[in-house]
Interface confidence: low
């Protein structure tokens, strides 16, 4: 069937469509033209003869049409008028006729649109805006935007005027957008310049910075106060209520406790008429004096006084703070603060709670320190120590014995032989001393601020004879690869030489053996099960020599990795199996079997009757030597097999 | 020393009502002002009231003005938050806290354990 | 509203060494009034640093704050295995009071 095709459908002033025809019938005569519904000479555009290849214009040619071979319409430079329908008159050869018809429809290309508002400047919450988008223009499609996104969706947004028209109820500062319009047809889009809404809003109730209002007497005050508002508020202060300048920022230097009271902040917005306000109020503290500690006992005694430190002066609404050794207060139960910090007492004192002690008074962001505080804690005498430590000496000697006490005040001293005072100093001297002089020797300490006394006594020997010396050891059983034993040769004595053996020999050199303190001590460092072994000392002066008894030393060691006997992992079924374990352990280790991981009997010895493949499996012996803390165990395959089926197998015990 | 404890969290509807306390001691509780500050799980601080040291000045965040009142009984040392109208987004670990220094706002140097409301139907 | 954005979100550091984080202000905040907080997980915050640089009692030296305006930094000096946490920055400047989202420093 004939038809007519328009490309393109929809057609912009000034340009060009083509009249496309289909399904052209075989042997024509020629074709022509019509504006409109039908064939009517009035009105025809073009006819074309096939033959002599003629076209020929009717009344309705405009100068703007060309006719082609295969009978299209190209029409150009279309105009409004060009709308509507065409008829293509078709002739055949055999005089025949047929027809078609098509259509196009013409749309004008659209001017740039602009945006007109009835308010250009409106109230926040009281006025409406009607933004209308210039020209009107028919068959045309409205579209707004705001900040380039479509409208969204909002009671207070309404279209009108074939959306033509966006007004805003009641506008807010958040209306403050870029809004466009954009005018559409079938062949043209126009958007329009942005216009940009201009909300009248505030003064918002005023914020005053910095918010703190607490200030200190020297201090400068900067108030700043910010309202949001459009246009940008007007500021005023008042103090008390009295009117002080028109700024946004209220500076008063050096402020004193007469700058306290409330400041008011006055916004104001000159296109709205409308004032808000805002009250901080603000109080300035005279410098607090520098505070100070007082004591209720300037010379405690030790586990016997407490002590109640109190900062001064006493100010009400205050923070007090302590520190102890310039750091904050330790936790401790001997530690006590009152309800309002300003008192801390220190129940029982020791020697250790000299201090210092300093108190501080927090005012605002700074704290303010008394001077530091040293306690004066009487303690001791504690017990006397005697030195030197020698108790043996040869006649002849000088005997030079001094004494001390740790003691606050200093400790006096008195010293006492076999019970008869004899000096109140420090140091006894005794020249060329005989036989006679061996006795008790005691030295007395006496504080005499807190009345106590301690004593000490030491038993001198004078002889030309040496003692027989004892060995004394740091370690009575120590672990092997773990502890350190040290052997001391008791006792001290004095210009005499120490020696020491080892299973009747002299010490052999070795890394892990060390003399000190004038040979008289024996370090072993790791000591080994190979050191368990008997060590004597012996004292020798110019005169006489001494060995002591023998001490043998107690290594602990072990468990080591345990053996199985028999080594046979193989069996006949009918066998007695016959399993012991055993550990190298000082002491003794406790043994325990598992068969395939199930715990079985505590013993050394593991024994079970007539075997048979069910007692397959692994057999684990483990040991653990209480002493050491150590534990070890190793695990042995067994295999029973059938009687007879395997040459060479155990038959067991 | 310093102590702030809170009570009075819990699972609540949206539209609920909560009322969250915080017990404080070892300070002189008229001179210090307080604030609520609260952590959304995972999310970040955020302050939502605070109150002077006499009680007379309140503050608010925007987000729950209208919503939730802040008050405090000086006789007892003891801070109130009373939240109504309670949305999910107000689901967070509550803090109270102290401020450091006389009538200073907003600088906390204590702070309570926290307590959890969570606003779900 | 002050807006506080800190940066970065996560720091990765290896003990003993030194991390520079940084807070940054949409307007201007008074040096006075800018404060840094250490939160782990489970606690409350405390706070370790005021007005920008003053360390707050009982914070070790190692903790330093500095900058001013717009923009301020902590800085820990040498990391502890206890500073591995959350830090936040804030202004107390003017209401609302706002804090920053912190930055996580974490064990690399």
């Known amino acids: 069937k004939l038809t007519i095709e328009s490309t393109p459908f929809n057609v912009a002033e000034g340009k060009e469509v083509l009249l496309l025809v289909h399904n052209l019938p075989q042997h024509l005569f020629g074709y022509s033209w019509y504006k409109g519904e039908r064939v009517d000479g009035n009105r025809q555009i073009i006819g074309y003869v096939i033959g002599t290849q003629q076209a020929t214009p009717g009344p309705a040619y405009s100068g703007r049409e060309i006719i082609y071979p295969n009978a299209s319409l190209l029409i150009q430079n279309i105009i409004q008028n060009d709308t509507g329908f065409y008829t293509l008159h078709v002739i055949k050869s055999d005089l025949v006729n047929e027809e078609a018809t098509g259509q196009f429809r013409v749309y004008p290309e659209l001017p740039k649109p602009s945006i007109s508002s009835n308010n250009s400047k409106p109230v926040e919450d009281k006025d409406a805006v009607a933004f209308t988008c210039e020209p009107e223009t028919q068959d045309a499609t409205y579209l707004w935007w705001v900040n380039n996104q479509s409208l969204p969706v909002s009671p207070r947004l309404q279209l009108s005027n074939g959306n033509r028209t966006l007004t805003l109820f009641n506008v807010t500062r958040n209306d403050t957008a870029s809004y466009k319009c954009e005018t559409q047809n079938p062949v043209s889009a126009r958007r329009s310049d942005s216009v940009i809404l201009n909300v009248l809003y505030g003064p918002d109730a005023p914020t005053i910075s910095p918010l703190n209002t607490s200030y200190r007497s020297g201090e400068n005050l900067n108030l700043s106060c910010h309202a949001a508002s459009n246009p940008p508020a007007q500021y005023s202060w008042f103090v008390n209520g009295t009117f002080q300048q028109s700024t946004q920022e209220l500076f008063i230097p050096n402020i004193t406790v007469n700058n306290s009271g409330s400041y008011t902040c006055q916004a104001h917005n000159s296109d709205t008429g409308l004032n808000r306000t805002t009250v901080t109020t603000i109080t300035v503290y005279a410098e607090p004096p520098k505070p100070f500690i007082t004591s209720n006992n300037s010379n405690p005694v030790e586990d016997e006084d407490a002590v109640a430190l109190t900062c001064e002066p006493e100010i009400q609404n205050t923070t007090y703070l302590w520190w102890v050794n310039n750091q904050s207060l330790p936790v401790s139960p001997r530690l006590q603060l009152s309800n309002d910090n300003r008192t801390l007492t220190l129940l029982s004192v020791t020697r250790n709670d000299v201090g210092p002690y300093e108190c501080g008074i927090q005012n605002e962001l700074s704290v303010d320190h008394s001077d530091p505080v040293i306690l004066n804690v009487l303690y001791g005498p504690d017990d006397p120590t005697i030195s030197p430590s020698y108790t043996y000496y040869r006649p002849g000697v000088n005997l030079s014995l001094s004494c001390h006490a740790a003691s606050n005040p200093p400790a006096q001293y008195s010293w006492l032989i076999d019970g008869n005072i004899q000096q109140h100093t420090q140091e006894l001297f005794i020249s060329n001393i005989t036989e006679k002089n061996s006795g008790l020797y005691t030295c007395q300490a006496n504080n005499s601020a807190s009345g106590h006394s301690r004593t000490t006594v030491k038993t001198i020997t004078v002889s030309a004879e040496l003692p027989k010396p004892s060995i004394s050891s740091n370690n009575s059983k120590p672990v092997e690869d773990k502890d350190a034993v040290a052997f001391t040769c008791e006792p001290e004595a004095q210009n005499t030489t120490y020696l020491w053996w080892v299973n009747g020999q002299s010490l052999p050199v070795s890394p892990r053996l060390q003399l000190s303190n004038g040979n008289r001590t024996l370090t072993l460092f790791n000591v080994t099960r190979n050191d368990a072994r008997a060590y004597v000392c012996g004292i020798q002066n110019s005169v006489s020599a001494n060995r002591s008894d023998p001490v043998t030393l107690d290594v602990l060691y072990g468990p080591d990795t345990p053996i199985i006997s028999p080594p046979d992992s193989s069996y006949l079924s009918g066998a007695n199996l016959n399993l012991s374990c055993h550990s190298a352990s000082n002491p003794s280790p406790q043994y325990s079997w598992r068969i395939n991981g199930i715990p079985q009997q505590h013993t050394q010895v593991l024994f079970i009757a007539k075997i048979t493949p069910n007692n397959n499996g692994t057999y684990a012996c483990f040991v653990s030597n209480l002493a050491t803390g150590r534990n070890n165990s190793i695990v042995k395959s067994i295999t029973v097999s059938a009687s007879g089926t395997s040459p060479g197998l155990s038959a067991g015990a | 020393q310093v102590q702030l404890v809170q009570s009075g969290g819990g699972l609540v509807q949206p539209g609920g009502s909560l009322r969250l306390s915080c017990a404080a001691s070892g300070f002189t509780f008229t001179s210090y002002a307080m604030s609520w500050v609260r952590q959304a799980p995972g999310k970040c601080l955020e302050w939502v009231s605070a109150?002077?040291?006499?009680?007379?000045?309140?503050f608010y965040a925007d987000s729950v003005k209208g919503r939730f009142t802040f008050s405090r009984d000086n006789s007892k040392n003891t801070l109130y938050l009373q939240m109504n109208s309670l949305r999910a987004e107000d689901t967070a670990v509550y803090y109270c806290a102290k401020d450091l220094g006389w009538l200073q706002y907003g600088l906390f140097d204590y702070w309570g354990q926290g307590t959890l409301v969570t606003v779900s139907s | 509203d002050i807006q506080l954005t800190q940066s970065p979100a996560t720091l990765s550091v290896s003990p003993g060494e030194r991390a520079t984080l940084s807070c940054r202000a949409s307007?201007?905040?008074?040096?006075?009034?800018l404060a840094w907080y250490q939160q782990k997980p489970g606690q409350a915050p405390r706070l370790l640093i005021y007005g920008a640089s003053s360390r707050a009692t009982g914070i070790p030296d190692r903790f330093s704050g500095s900058g001013s305006g717009t923009d301020f930094t902590l800085t820990i000096s040498r990391l502890e295995p206890e500073d591995f946490a959350v830090y936040y920055c804030?202004?107390?400047?003017?209401?609302?009071?706002?804090f920053g989202c912190g930055t996580k420093v974490e064990i690399k």
């Open positions: 804030q202004q107390y400047n003017n209401w609302p009071l706002t």
């Open positions: 307007q201007s905040v008074s040096s006075s009034y």
């Open positions: 109150i002077s040291g006499t009680g007379d000045s309140t």
